[in-house]
């Protein structure tokens, strides 16, 4: 009778085991083991027992002990079960960003592992079990579907294998996949709102604002603002589920023409974009040209207004004839024209908008001097001892210097308050002098003596 010990063994893959083959007869003709495994017989006392070290056990095996005794030949098998944890436990790759409301399929693949009867695959969200199934097939595959919710944001999904050898007196061996961290998001179907000037003048700055509501998580939203090839650098302000991106845009002559202004919002693996056209224009103020900015009275003056070739101008409210970018007027300079403003207004249509620019020039007319009766009366009669202010205004451009002298020496205090005395009486010669020449006028002061009663 042949016996084997142990009759059942569970051992790690690649491990070794000692198997004892025994026979009930004292002097067996033959005692041995039949196995494809590498084996070593060990030293033992006696003849009816042999111990074999079986090594590098890679798969389940059934070594067979045999003995040949006088009463016949017999055999006994031992059952070697190899255990090993899976070589690969992997969640199928998924985009890390998933839109809320989408059905997400988690697929776990398990390669290897034995004994399969003791191997279970578990899909988890955090520590919560989503699905538990025995490992079947090679590779074993377990799938489950998850409806993506907002509160799943940042959740870790993983796959775990459990090789439960506790019934065999061993432990529970666990292998866990690398976690998949889910990033959930909501990007509304509405495009972002873009507020910007439709037209922008060269060498000026404009403000662009892009905003969008109903985002989750708003802090993860990327905003890209660009005008043509120029990336704008916005300042982004976040609300609970909204953002507003504000940027300054500067344009130069190189940008002139129609440019595309884009605002793109990227969240997760989706994007929403708004496009707008901005017309960059160059429109210098019109040019007002006077023949000479300073002329003498009676001189003929030409006033010209020139503007952008596509502009329409009016000069002092009078439209150009024909309507266009140039206008002019002719005048003979009079004193009344001194300080007169000539205003040119140019209007340019850019992308359906009317842009207005103005330029004003002032004409200086040199005239005089003049001394008129109205401004410098020839006769004054004042009571003696009364308070009076002699007035004499000389006119001209430049303003003339005025002196009124009696007998060439005694001055009349023009514009000053004086007490009228007998000395003030007489005829004064008022002389107004400027670069334009001089004029004189006689002024007589009469002093009335008080009546003595």
């Amino acid at each position: 009778q042949t016996s084997v010990s142990p009759s059942k063994v569970i051992l790690p893959r690649g491990g070794s085991v000692l198997v004892t083959c025994s026979t009930s007869c004292d002097q067996p003709k033959l005692l041995g083991i039949e196995t494809p495994l590498p084996k070593k017989e060990l030293l033992l006392p006696g003849n009816n027992r042999k111990v074999y070290e079986l090594s590098n056990v890679q798969e389940d095996s059934q070594p067979m002990c045999y003995s040949n005794c006088p009463d016949g030949q017999s055999t006994a098998k031992t059952f070697l079960t190899v255990y090993w944890t899976p070589e690969r436990v992997e969640l199928a790759p998924l985009p890390s960003w998933q839109p809320v409301g989408k059905n997400l399929t988690l697929r776990c693949q398990v390669e290897g592992g034995a004994p399969r009867a003791n191997l279970t695959v578990v899909l988890l969200r955090g520590e919560k079990e989503l699905k538990r199934e025995p490992a079947v097939g090679e590779p074993a595959e377990v799938t489950t579907t998850v409806l993506v919710r907002r509160d799943h944001h940042g959740a870790n999904f993983s796959c775990r294998t459990e090789l439960d050898l506790r019934p065999q007196g061993l432990e529970l061996f666990e292998n866990t996949s690398a976690p998949y961290q889910l990033q959930t998001f909501v990007l509304p179907a509405t495009p972002p709102q873009l507020v910007s000037p439709r037209v922008l003048e060269v060498d000026t700055q404009g403000t662009v604002v892009c905003s969008l509501d109903g985002l989750f998580p708003v802090s993860e939203a990327q905003v890209h603002l660009a005008l043509g090839d120029q990336r704008l650098n916005p300042t982004v302000t976040y609300g609970n589920d909204s953002f507003s991106a504000k940027a300054s845009v500067s344009v130069t002559a190189e940008d002139e023409g129609t440019q595309r202004l884009t605002c793109a919002v990227i969240l997760g693996n989706q994007s929403q974009e708004t496009l707008q056209t901005v017309t960059i224009y160059s429109f210098p103020a019109p040019n007002v040209i006077l023949t000479k900015p300073e002329v003498s009275e009676g001189t003929e003056v030409t006033v010209k207004c020139e503007a952008h070739p596509r502009a329409k101008v009016t000069l002092n409210g009078v439209p150009a004839q024909p309507l266009g970018p140039r206008a002019q007027l002719l005048l003979k300079a009079t004193p009344e024209d001194n300080g007169r403003s000539f205003s040119c207004s140019a209007t340019l249509e850019v992308a359906g908008q009317l842009i207005h620019k103005n330029q004003t020039r002032e004409l200086r007319v040199l005239y005089g001097p003049r001394l008129d009766e109205r401004d410098c009366p020839g006769n004054w009669t004042w009571p003696e001892n009364s308070q009076q202010t002699p007035m004499c205004q000389a006119w001209g451009n430049p303003l003339p210097e005025l002196k009124c002298l009696k007998d060439g020496t005694f001055p009349l205090p023009i514009g000053e308050s004086v007490t009228v005395t007998r000395d003030l009486e007489g005829t004064y010669l008022c002389r107004a002098r400027s670069t334009q020449g001089e004029v004189t006028r006689k002024v007589t002061v009469n002093v009335l003596s008080p009546r003595y009663e």
Partner: antibody, heavy 121, light 106 residues
Framework: QVQLKESGPALVKPTQTLTLTCTFS??????????VGWIRQPPGKALEWLAL???????YYSTSLKTRLTISKDTSKNQVVLTMTNMDPVDTATYYC?????????????WGQGTLVTVSS | DIELTQPPSVSVAPGQTARISCSGD??????ASWYQQKPGQAPVLVIY???DRPSGIPERFSGSNSGNTATLTISGTQAEDEADYYC?????????FGGGTKLTVL
């Protein structure tokens, strides 16, 4: 460290019984798997294995000398004793005791210095 | 009983590789050990469990065992390796030594 030392008579008369003692230190014969054995070497000849006793008191003997040999142990004294009956001049040899760290694998990792036993009348 | 057969002598030039064989019926199914013995000294274990080297034994000593032959290999043999070498195995319930090989370093 592990040490073994053989002791016994240097001269034995033919037909007498030889008693050799192996005293060891640095290990215990009550440790699972451990054994102590005896080997002899006649002058100018090869090593010849004689006997072995293990921690479990299992005894192993050379088939050709089995009837003349007895091996025993005194675990408390850390000693192993070998007796060989009916000594003959051909039994003249250096007798060694050695430790088997894993008896079932049969190798001897530490040897005593040996004791020369001459059998002569 | 198993018998272990070794060549009586092997010669090798210093620095060369020496190989000493030990043959026995189905020897590869059992563990083999090797001992070095210098004149007047006790044997020293140099290889056990076919190919394992005890601590303190130089790396130039290596062993193998398969089929009916165990082999002790000394790579880059040195003058101090000149000695008698014994193989050892077992045939339950007894232990067996080979007849020994004298290694001469030329």
């Amino acid at each position: 460290q592990v040490q073994l030392k053989e002791s016994g008579p240097a001269l034995v008369k033919p037909t007498q019984t030889l008693t050799l003692t192996c005293t060891f230190s640095g290990f215990s014969l009550s440790t699972s798997g451990v054994g102590v054995g005896w080997i002899r070497q006649p002058p100018g000849k090869a090593l010849e294995w004689l006997a072995l006793i293990d921690w479990d008191d299992d005894k192993y003997y050379s088939t050709s000398l089995k009837t003349r040999l007895t091996i025993s142990k005194d675990t408390s004294k850390n000693q192993v004793v070998l007796t060989m009956t009916n000594m003959d001049p051909v039994d003249t040899a250096t007798y060694y005791c050695a430790r088997y760290p894993v008896t079932q694998r049969s190798y001897m990792d530490v040897w005593g210095q040996g004791t020369l036993v001459t059998v002569s009348s | 009983d198993i018998e272990l057969t070794q060549p009586p002598s092997v010669s090798v030039a210093p620095g060369q590789t020496a190989r000493i064989s030990c043959s026995g019926d189905a020897l590869g199914d059992k563990y083999a050990s090797w001992y070095q013995q210098k004149p007047g000294q006790a044997p020293v274990l140099v290889i056990y469990d076919d190919s394992d080297r005890p601590s303190g034994i130089p790396e130039r000593f290596s062993g193998s065992n398969s089929g009916n032959t165990a082999t002790l290999t000394i790579s880059g043999t040195q003058a101090e390796d000149e000695a008698d070498y014994y193989c050892q195995s077992y045939d339950s319930p007894q232990v067996v030594f080979g007849g020994g090989t004298k290694l001469t370093v030329l």
